[in-house]
C-alpha cells in the first residue's frame, strides 16, 4: 500500500457474525479508518485487550477504528465486540509495511498506551497469532549464519516471552556475540551461529491465565574446508577501444581467509611458457579478500600493449583456484568515419 | 535416486543388544535430520529417535530413553541406532526416515525386523 | 494408547469422498504443523500430506489436509481401491519434556 492511501476494511454496514482473522500490513504515516458495525449501534474497538478511547491519535468512535498516522506501536491485534455482548464482529492483526523502520526494536509497544481511559475485555490465555511463521521447526544452517526464531503471540493480559535452550533459561551471556531478544517481534535472533549454538530453543510464552511453548530445532553445520571457489563466466573475455577504460571483475568465494592476484601473461624471448611447463605472467595487483576492491582490476586508457590474457589466481590454506580472460584492444575509431558516418543514411 | 537402506535386525534375547544401519543415498545427508520409527506387528507407527544433520543434537522416545543411543557417520552416508537392554516390547520392524524442516519424514527406508525373544 | 486420537477404522465406495480425523492437543496439533502417512499393505509409510495441507510431489490432488485449533482432517475424495491402506496423522509435540514425535493411532481404510 502507497503511503498516501487510506487502508478501509468496509463501509459501516451490518456485520458477519462469521467475522475470519484478517491481517492487514500499512504503511508507516497511512492514515487507516476501519468500520465494525452499524454507526449508531458500531462495536466497541479494543486492542490487545484494551478498550480504545474515543478520543485520541488512535481512536474507537461509533464503530469505527480511526489512526491519524500509523506509527510501529499501532501494530498489534484488534478486536471488535458487539456491544452489550461479547461477540467478536471484527478480528483483525495490522502490521507495519517495514517492521524494521520501529526505532527500537526491543521498545514495549505497551509503554505508548494510555491506560486511564480504557476498559479491560474477558482474560484470554496466551495463543499463537502467526502460527504459520512457525512453521520451519527444524533449522540446519552453516556456521557463520544469522538465525531468527518467532513466537509472535497474544492474551489477555498481554503475555510475556522468554526463552530456553536445550531446557534451561537462555540469555545469551555465555554466547559470543550475544543475543537479540526483540520482545515486540517477539523474538531470538543470533548472529554468526558456531556449532556450541546446537540444539533446542523454546519460547515460553505466558500471562497469568496460562502458558503455551514452542520448541525450534537448531543445527549449526561446519563449513567443509575448500580451495577458493570462483564464479563461473569471471573474469569475462572483453573487447575495448585504445584509449578507454576496462573493468575485469573476479568474484571470490572462501570460508578460510583467501588471498588474490591478478596476473597478465607475457612473452619473454618468443615464449609464452617457461622451462618448467608454467607460464610467463607480471604480477599486476595482489591482496587479501579484505582489501577495497580487490576484485576488479581496473586498467586506465588501454592501449594495444594491454591486450592479452589476464588470470584472476585465488588461494587459501587449502590449495588455489584461477580462471582467466581475454582482453581484445581495438584501434580506435576513424574520426572522419565517424563523422560522416551518420549522413550516410541521408544519401541515395 | 534417494534412497534408505536398513540393515541389522535379526532376532535377539531379551537384555540384549543391537545395532541397526540405515545408508543413505541420493541427497545430501549431513545437512538432514535423521529419524527412527518403529512398527510393532499389527499395530501403529511409534517414533523412536531423531538426529540433526551434525549429529550434535538429539532425541528420544520416552520409551527408549537410556536404552537406545542414535548416531550417524556422515563420511560414511549412515545412521545408526544402538539398541542396548532389549525387551520384547521392542520388537518390531525399525524404519529410518529423512526428515524435512517442518517436522515431516518425507523418505522412508523398506524396513529392517528387528525379534526380542527368548 | 496413542497421544492422536483416530478412529480405528473408516469405510467408503469407490467415487465417494471419505474424511478421517485426527484430535490431539495443544502441545502438538495446536502448536505444530501436521502430517499424514499412507501405509499399503506390506509396505513403509509414504508422506501423503505435510504442513496440514501440502502434497508432495506425485500425490493426486484427491488427497487434501485440514486443521482446526487442535484437530486436524484428511480428507479423500473420487475414493478408489487402490486407497485401501492405513493412515497414520503425526506432529511434533512441544510438552514440557518435548520436543519429540507424536503418531496416531492410524485409522484403516477400506474400500467397500
Known amino acids: 500500500l502507497e503511503a498516501s492511501e487510506e487502508v478501509e476494511l468496509e463501509p459501516c454496514l451490518a456485520p458477519s457474525l462469521e467475522q475470519q482473522e484478517q491481517e492487514l500490513t500499512v504503511a508507516l504515516g497511512q492514515p487507516v479508518r476501519l468500520c465494525c458495525g452499524r454507526a449508531e449501534r458500531g462495536g466497541h474497538w479494543y486492542k490487545e485487550g484494551s478498550r480504545l478511547a474515543p478520543a485520541g491519535r488512535v481512536r474507537g468512535w461509533r464503530g469505527r477504528l480511526e489512526i491519524a498516522s500509523f506509527l510501529p506501536e499501532d501494530a498489534g491485534r484488534y478486536l471488535c465486540l458487539a456491544r452489550g455482548s461479547m461477540i467478536v464482529l471484527q478480528n483483525l492483526t495490522l502490521i507495519t509495511g517495514d517492521s524494521l523502520t520501529s526505532s527500537n526494536d526491543d521498545e514495549d509497544p505497551k509503554s505508548h498506551r494510555d491506560p486511564s481511559n480504557r476498559h479491560s475485555y474477558p482474560q484470554q490465555a496466551p495463543y499463537w497469532t502467526h502460527p504459520q511463521r512457525m512453521e520451519k521447526k527444524l533449522h540446519a544452517v552453516p556456521a557463520g549464519n544469522t538465525v531468527k526464531f518467532r513466537c509472535p503471540a497474544a492474551g489477555n493480559p498481554t503475555p510475556t516471552i522468554r526463552w530456553l535452550k536445550d531446557g534451561q533459561a537462555f540469555h545469551g551471556e555465555n554466547r559470543i556475540g550475544g543475543i537479540r531478544l526483540r520482545h515486540q517481534h517477539w523474538s531470538l535472533v543470533m548472529e554468526s551461529v558456531v556449532p556450541s549454538d546446537r540444539g533446542t530453543y523454546t519460547c515460553l510464552v505466558e500471562n497469568a491465565v496460562g502458558s503455551i511453548r514452542y520448541n525450534y530445532l537448531l543445527d549449526v553445520l561446519e563449513r567443509s574446508p575448500h580451495r577458493p571457489i570462483l564464479q563461473a563466466g569471471l573474469p569475462a573475455n572483453t573487447t575495448a577501444v585504445v584509449g578507454s577504460d576496462v573493468e575485469l571483475l573476479c568474484k571470490v568465494y572462501s570460508d578460510a581467509q583467501p588471498h588474490i592476484q591478478w596476473l597478465k601473461h607475457i612473452v619473454i624471448n618468443g615464449s609464452s611458457f617457461g622451462a618448467d611447463g608454467f607460464p610467463y605472467v607480471q604480477v599486476l595487483k595482489t591482496a587479501d579478500i579484505n582489501s577495497s576492491e580487490v576484485e576488479v582490476l581496473y586498467l586506465r586508457n588501454v592501449s594495444a600493449e594491454d591486450a592479452g590474457e589476464y588470470t584472476c589466481l585465488a588461494g587459501n590454506s587449502i590449495g588455489l583456484s584461477y580462471q582467466s580472460a581475454w582482453l581484445t584492444v581495438l584501434p580506435e575509431e576513424d574520426p572522419t568515419w565517424t563523422a560522416a558516418a551518420p549522413e550516410a543514411r541521408y544519401t541515395d | 535416486e534417494v534412497q534408505l537402506l536398513e540393515s541389522g535386525g535379526g532376532l535377539v534375547q531379551p537384555g540384549g543388544s543391537l545395532r541397526l544401519s540405515c545408508a543413505a543415498s541420493?541427497?545430501?545427508?549431513?545437512?538432514?535430520?535423521m529419524s527412527w520409527v518403529r512398527q510393532a506387528p499389527g499395530k501403529g507407527l511409534e517414533w523412536v529417535s531423531a538426529?540433526?544433520?551434525?549429529?550434535?543434537?538429539?532425541y528420544y522416545a520416552d520409551s527408549v530413553k537410556g536404552r537406545f543411543t542414535i548416531s550417524r557417520d556422515n563420511s560414511k552416508n549412515t545412521l545408526y541406532l544402538q539398541m542396548n537392554s532389549l525387551r520384547a516390547e521392542d520388537t518390531a520392524v525399525y524404519y529410518c526416515?529423512?526428515?524435512?524442516?517442518?517436522?515431516?519424514?518425507?523418505?522412508w527406508g523398506q524396513g529392517t525386523l528387528v525379534t526380542v525373544s527368548s | 494408547q496413542s497421544v492422536l486420537t483416530q478412529p480405528p477404522s473408516a469405510s467408503g465406495t469407490p467415487g465417494q469422498r471419505v474424511t478421517i480425523s485426527c484430535s490431539g492437543g495443544?502441545?502438538?496439533?495446536?502448536?505444530?504443523?501436521v502430517n499424514w502417512y499412507q501405509q499399503l499393505p506390506g509396505t513403509a509409510p509414504k508422506l501423503l500430506i505435510y504442513r496440514n495441507n501440502q502434497r508432495p510431489s506425485g500425490v493426486p490432488d484427491r488427497f487434501s489436509g485440514s486443521k482446526s485449533g487442535t484437530s486436524s482432517s484428511l480428507a479423500i475424495s473420487g475414493l478408489r481401491s487402490e486407497d485401501e491402506a492405513d493412515y497414520y496423522c503425526a506432529a511434533w509435540d512441544d510438552s514440557l519434556n518435548g520436543p519429540y514425535v507424536v503418531f496416531g493411532g492410524g485409522t484403516k481404510l477400506t474400500v467397500l
Open positions: 541420493g541427497f545430501t545427508f549431513s545437512r538432514n535430520y
Open positions: 526416515a529423512r526428515v524435512t524442516s517442518p517436522g515431516a519424514f518425507d523418505i
Open positions: 538426529i540433526s544433520g551434525s549429529g550434535g543434537s538429539t
Open positions: 495443544t502441545s502438538n496439533i495446536g502448536t505444530n504443523t
